[in-house]
């Protein structure tokens, strides 16, 4: 796991440069875990980064992710999805210059090295859910969320609003 040392290279409170023309509202360094308290970890394998969902040993340190928050104005007449108004979006970076990306074709979540401005695939609408959980909805594919499948992160289509709270798309953020 590389997340901790990588993120400590972020010495600023906020990004200096803007992303897609806007600066983040704030940033937050947190560990990411599932609804069932499994940790999201990151590992370098064969020159590419893999994302795992696993139980950590008692004293094992959790990987950290830098969440950068952005304000998004979402007029319903433009989107056509009946969602309007202000919302919060995030990007997730477990180590410098790498961000989580939604690969909608493969229904996968990947770590990509990229330069700013970040592509839309790196942005997720952040949902404040019950039980102190959050969900991450793809900016590029409304109704598709980061979820857990076979001990990996995957993109999961939520077919109705009533399924927004299914456990496999709920995550916990923790400073510890």
């Amino acid at each position: 796991a590389f997340g901790i040392s990588g993120v400590q290279k972020y010495t600023r409170a906020l990004h200096d440069s803007s992303i897609t023309g806007i600066s983040p509202i704030t940033e937050y360094l947190a560990s990411l875990s599932t609804y069932n308290d499994q940790s999201i970890t990151f590992a370098l394998e064969d020159e590419s980064y893999e994302i795992y969902v696993e139980d950590l040993k008692k004293d094992e340190k959790k990987d950290k992710v830098l969440l950068s928050y952005y304000e998004s104005q979402h007029p319903s007449n433009e989107s056509g999805d009946g969602v309007d108004g202000k919302m919060l979006m995030v990007t997730l970076s477990p180590t410098k210059d790498f961000w989580l990306h939604a690969n909608n074709k493969e229904h996968s979540v990947e770590l990509h090295k990229c330069e700013k401005p970040l592509p839309d695939q790196a942005f997720f609408v952040l949902h404040n859910m019950h039980s102190n959980c959050v969900s991450f909805e793809c900016k590029t594919d409304p109704g598709v969320f980061i979820g857990v499948k076979d001990n990996h992160l995957a993109l999961i289509k939520v077919d109705s609003s009533e399924n927004l709270c299914t456990e496999n798309i709920l995550f916990k953020l923790s400073e510890t």
Epitope: Y28, G85, H130, T166
Partner: antibody, heavy 121, light 111 residues
Amino acid sequence: EVQLVESGGGLVQPGGSLRLSCAASGFTFNKFWMNWVRQAPGKGLEWVAEIRLNSINYVKDYAESVKGRFTISRDNAKNSVYLQMNSLRAEDTAVYYCIRRNYGNWFFEIWGQGTLVTVSS
Amino acid sequence: DIQMTQSPSSLSASVGDRVTITCRASESVDRYGISFMNWFQQKPGKAPKLLIYAASNQGSGVPSRFSGSGSGTDFTLTISSLQPEDFATYYCQHSKEVPYTFGQGTKVEIK
């Protein structure tokens, strides 16, 4: 245009019942959490109830002052949210506002114009 | 329950004045690095209108003279240059967890 329109308010005797309705338009209703907030004449704002989306049913929360007497519900097919108020008391006299949280459920974004409920004999 | 204490309860000011309203929560309203603190404006006979959400972000169509700041338990709403249409009552509110509580309100009147 995004709109919330409340109805059903009126004069009711103590101990009586009333059902408030809130008709939503201009957005996909079933993607949003809904709330009721009230304001007694000349007083401040008091949160009353919330109905959230859940995989099995709707999660509902109530202010302590109305718990066991008020019930929040929604009908997504009719783009409406309701507040059934039973065992009404004089202190329930207020303007009742229907509110939509923002997409992502962080804050109260859209308010209706309100409907007045008067509990008096 | 989280209690919200707003001050002052009323103030008199003139057009062009800088106005500051404060709100203190009985415990932190922060979660996930975000402050669940919001500010609303209400004019007589009208519904409240969202001014500021997440402590410092403007609601849709809100003039830039309205700004918010703070985190944890202490928050401030500032009107940089009071306009005639700003005379109203202002409420803070937290949306961290139920019950969502409001401050008692600050009435801004013409001096």
